[in-house]
Amino acid sequence: ELCDDDPPEIPHATFKAMAYKEGTMLNCECKRGFRRIKSGSLYMLCTGNSSHSSWDNQCQCTSSATRNTTKQVTPQPEEQKERKTTEMQSPMQPVDQASLPGHCREPPPWENEATERIYHFVVGQMVYYQCVQGYRALHRGPAESVCKMTHGKTRWTQPQLICTGEMETSQFPGEEKPQASPEGRPESETSCLVTTTDFQIQTEMAATMETSIFTTEYQ
């Protein structure tokens, strides 16, 4: 089941999936001056079986001006630099993505891909948030969001993260006030059947990741 919306936006933060659940789709898009080859795929799809998951289809771009110049190679470092994705800025090496069953790792870049990747997530997907450079995290809970199915509708849980500028001194007095639930909603609202496939395994993953995501920023 596709998530109806995108993950929530947190001011001065970016999100990233560490692995993509089977069923996730990625737009095949090209940067300005290039277009998908005519017979090329519109989307990549994370598919697999119980033992192995991988991305079906390949995205291929060709110059808008010249025809039939289709190459499938990894961009040079300077090309990669300009890609504005939802990837986090600081280097992190969390849990091995391949170790999560039923998930695909980040697809490798394709030549002349667009500067932003558009993913279409499925229920059970978890994304992790980190403050952008120049901002620091004030935690009130997990800095992650999960796409859940509730009452037949999909929604993303609210990440408990505030990003504040380094110069700001307001420390939110009494910051550690407990929340009613991780989503910041009363439990009564979410008491019906909730589908969160792989939630436990990803929560454990998040716990091991917590250190790597939020310490690299200040080293």
């Epitope: 596709l2 109806d4 919306d5 995108d6 789709m25 737009n27 095949c28 898009e29 090209c30 277009r35 998908r36 519109l42 989307y43 799809l45 558009i118 279409h120």
Partner: nanobody, 111 residues
Framework: EVQLVESGGGLVQPGGSLRLSCAAS????????MAWYRQAPGKQRELVAT???????TYADSVKGRFTISRDNAKNTVYLQMNSLRPEDTAVYYC?????WGQGTQVTVSS
């Protein structure tokens, strides 16, 4: 889930025009690459035209210069303007986004 509903098909004479519409719901429309496919009796479904999020378009050689795909993100709708229609354009036309398909709309070009 994405719901797609096509409209605008019908019977038209060779050389005539039709405008197909496809209304999408259930997902943020502006994030979707939209496509029109068609399937003639006894033939495989073929890609007619696509439109990216930024408006970039691609067409099958057989319709280039005659068909125009466009989108209105405010209305969550994609269009296929078909001019100079030929008998060989007769088919059921399907709207597509992600792995989702509309029910199809019949286009018949005949005198």
């Amino acid at each position: 889930e994405v719901q797609l509903v096509e409209s605008g098909g019908g019977l038209v004479q060779p050389g005539g025009s039709l405008r197909l519409s496809c209304a999408a719901s259930g997902r943020k429309f502006s994030t979707l690459i939209m496509a029109w496919y068609r399937q003639a009796p006894g033939k495989q479904r073929e890609l007619v035209a696509t439109i990216e999020r930024d408006g970039t378009t691609t067409y099958a050689d057989s319709v280039k210069g005659r068909f125009t795909i466009s989108r209105d993100n405010a209305k969550n709708t994609v269009y296929l303007q078909m001019n100079s229609l030929r008998p060989e354009d007769t088919a059921v036309y399907y709207c597509n986004a992600l792995q989702y398909w509309g029910q199809g709309t019949q286009v018949t070009v005949s005198s």
